[in-house]
């Protein structure tokens, strides 16, 4: 057993049926010593008296709030929360498994540049009694400091018969240098209770690999006289670091028809200009990324042709 | 990712065309490490990562964009001295602070490429004949170190009587590997900035 | 005491369908995760599916996904492995499993896919 | 489709210590507990150790399990005419979690 926050306890269990579970000694927060009476969650039935109260906790019926009372007045609250661990791995079943980049993967993080400033996300299908909590560190032994804002419900989707609920965080490294080589990982630890049931998730990454530029901007179209062609010009997005000479990106111009089968052509390019044909009814479509380190791509910037 | 390989213009840089070729380079090999080792923990999330510049050189502070100098983050700098008669710069736009980035990334290759020859030896000597280091590497580093042109002690080549311990040399090959491409990632930066300056 | 019950195992013919059923009695039932594991005659175990607890997870062995069906009815306190499709390499002991660190199995039931 | 490697069978006469080995792989008995189960003909495998090297109450101490980096092993001290029967190790896969990866069984023949 140990404290999550001040009055709020997880009893870490190892889950399997017929488990003998775990003993838990509660003490009641009061200098008085006769008395005492205690009670779980809004049942009035006594479970025990005196300053302590000893418990087998085997199942959800074991958890919750435990309040010990003197005389109708109530003296101290514990909440206990249940963690369970299945054949030796702790459970997941709050998150779901977003199965991208690879299976097991329930937080999902991007940065738009290298400022150390990220957001993370991730989903459930739970609607209520839900909390998390985020913490995050450069490196785990010695850990450098990363502050995380508070995580909100940032999107509903409707999947199939389920609803399914994104939410997300952003964290910025206290001390980031963009052009730093990083050595140790970020580390982001999400704890998540629902009901009276407790799980943490992690992430591990180098800001590097979870770069993901913002679409270019003001794409526009220049036809060229006499000519089916146009040159195609944009610029760095807005949040990307600089300077552009050393953060440099690289960019993808693609001509797609309105038909998605019809044949893209693809134009690769370090400049912020490009020479393409443009075809009736088509468009133009240039997404981004950093030259040097292949991270993500950004989301295409697209115009029509016409 | 196939990227369209860039021919420098006569004016260009000198350096910048050297510079994309030993990302490529080295992006290549470790692409091939992770490959050929996939029984060995190779990928980024398993490796410890070290850096054999440590303490030596301080490419990353020497090199930092004039931008990026009023970050304080970025200037935890490592006193370093350095040689500073490089060729990379037309003269007149030869500063000290890019001299000593420059000479910095040349001491950088040069223990990169004696840790690789001296690993090369290694794994020339595995009955198993798992993997090399791609020639075609070892060469695009002397080439960026000859155009750098810095007058330095040739370090020699680390030797080692006692018999090699192949898995540990193939794991120390990764670990080399992914430091080396993200120093590889850092001189290409600055090689961009150098030109566009 | 965890006690796991089969039925439903029997000869059928390839293409055909079978249900095997897994009655649980002695534990809370609708608390933990369940398995369907099998073994061809002279052969080594396999699993073939995975349930969590509230039915909201469902996982599949390659050889089966598309065909078989894995659900539990917490009401009933049963597991259920619905067999589509059969084939004769489908031809094994099936036994019901819990999941966790100390696990309880089924009698294990047979089924012959033969024409 | 066997990813846990065991030998196809090993013997012993009564007394003799007798060793089983499961080899596996870094995403697999490198990140994940290791389970052993013993079989008799014609019945369901019964747990005989869990979490590399714990056993269950009811399990007799001359059964004992260990795990080393990605791999594992079963030993019986002094093995006895009753132990002759089928044994197969378990664990997981980092990516494939929930499903049960099995060894491909070892059939223990107890001589004389």
């Known amino acids: 057993i140990w404290e999550l926050k001040k009055d709020v306890y997880v009893v870490e269990l190892d889950w399997y049926p017929d488990a003998p579970g775990e003993m838990v000694v509660l003490t009641c927060d009061t200098p008085e010593e006769d008395g005492i009476t205690w009670t779980l969650d809004q049942s009035s039935e006594v479970l025990g008296s005196g300053k302590t109260l000893t418990i087998q906790v085997k199942e959800f019926g074991d958890a919750g709030q435990y309040t010990c009372h003197k005389g109708g007045e109530v003296l101290s609250h514990s909440l206990l929360l249940l963690h369970k661990k299945e054949d030796g791995i702790w459970s997941t079943d709050i998150l779901k498994d977003q199965k991208e980049p690879k299976n097991k993967t329930f937080l999902r993080c991007e940065a738009k540049n290298y400022s150390g400033r990220f957001t993370c996300w991730w989903l459930t299908t739970i609607s209520t009694d839900l909390t998390f909590s985020v913490k995050s560190s450069r490196g785990s032994s010695d850990p450098q400091g990363v502050t995380c804002g508070a995580a909100t419900l940032s999107a509903e989707r409707v999947r199939g018969d389920n609803k399914e609920y994104e939410y997300s965080v952003e964290c910025q490294e206290d001390s980031a240098c963009p052009a730093a080589e990083e050595s140790l990982p970020i580390e982001v630890m999400v704890d998540a209770v629902h009901k009276l049931k407790y799980e943490n998730y992690t992430s591990s990454f180098f800001i590097r690999d979870i770069i993901k530029p913002d679409p270019p901007k003001n794409l526009q179209l220049k036809p060229l006289k006499n000519s089916r062609q146009v040159e195609v010009s944009w610029e760095y997005p807005d949040t990307w670091s600089t300077p552009h000479s050393y953060f440099s990106l690289t960019f993808c111009v693609q001509v797609q028809g309105k038909s998605k089968r019809e044949k893209k052509d693809r134009v690769f390019t370090d400049k912020t200009s490009a020479t393409v044909i443009c075809r009736k009814n088509a468009s133009i479509s240039v997404r981004a990324q950093d030259r040097y380190y292949s991270s993500s791509w950004s989301e295409w910037a697209s115009v029509p042709c016409s | 990712r196939n990227l369209p390989v860039a021919t420098p213009d006569p004016g260009m840089f000198p350096c910048l065309h050297h510079s994309q070729n030993l990302l490529r380079a080295v992006s290549n090999m470790l692409q091939k490490a992770r490959q050929t080792l996939e029984f060995y923990p190779c990928t980024s999330e398993e490796i410890d990562h070290e850096d054999i510049t440590k303490d030596k050189t301080s490419t990353v502070e020497a090199c930092l964009p004039l931008e990026l100098t009023k970050n304080e983050s970025c200037l935890n700098s490592r006193e370093t001295s350095f040689i500073t008669n490089g060729s990379c710069l037309a003269s007149r736009k030869t500063s000290f602070m890019m001299a000593l980035c420059l000479s910095s990334i040349y001491e950088d290759l040069k223990m990169y490429q004696v840790e690789f020859k001296t690993m090369n030896a290694k794994l020339l000597m595995d009955p198993k004949r798992q993997i090399f280091l791609d020639q075609n590497m070892l060469a695009v580093i002397d080439e960026l170190m000859q155009a750098l042109n810095f007058n330095s002690e040739t370090v020699p080549q680390k030797s080692s009587l006692e018999e090699p311990d192949f898995y540990k040399t193939k794991i120390k090959l990764c670990i080399l590997l992914h430091a080396f491409r993200i120093r590889a990632v850092t001189i290409d930066r600055v090689m961009s900035y150098l030109n566009a300056s | 005491q965890v006690q796991l019950v089969q039925s439903g195992g029997g000869v059928v013919q390839p293409g055909r369908s079978l249900r095997l059923s897994c009655a649980a009695s002695?534990?809370?039932?609708?608390?933990?995760?369940m398995h369907w594991v099998r073994q061809a005659p002279g052969k080594g175990l396999e699993w073939v599916a995975f349930?969590?607890?509230?039915?909201?997870?469902?996982y599949y062995a390659d050889s089966v996904k598309g065909r078989f069906t894995i659900s539990r009815d917490n009401s009933k306190n049963t597991l259920y492995l619905q067999m589509k499709s059969l084939r004769a390499e489908d031809t094994a002991v099936y036994y019901c499993k819990t999941h966790g660190s100390h696990d309880n199995w089924g009698q294990g039931t047979m089924v012959t896919v033969s024409s | 489709s066997y990813v846990l490697t065991q030998p196809p069978s090993v013997s012993g006469t009564p007394g003799q210590r007798v060793t089983i080995s499961c080899s596996g792989g870094r995403s697999n008995i490198g990140k994940n507990t290791v389970k052993w189960y013993q079989q008799l003909p014609g019945t369901a495998p019964k747990l005989l150790i869990y979490g590399n090297d714990q056993r269950p109450s009811g399990v007799p101490d001359r059964f004992s399990g260990s795990k080393s980096g990605t791999s594992a092993s079963l030993a019986i001290t002094g093995v006895q005419a009753e132990d002759e029967a089928d044994y197969y190790c378990?664990?997981?896969?980092?990516?494939?979690?929930?499903?049960?990866?099995f060894g491909t069984g070892t059939k223990v023949t107890v001589l004389g």
């Open positions: 378990q664990s997981y896969d980092r990516g494939t979690h929930p499903a049960l990866l």
């Open positions: 349930i969590r607890y509230d039915g909201s997870n469902k």
């Open positions: 002695g534990f809370t039932f609708s608390s933990y995760g």
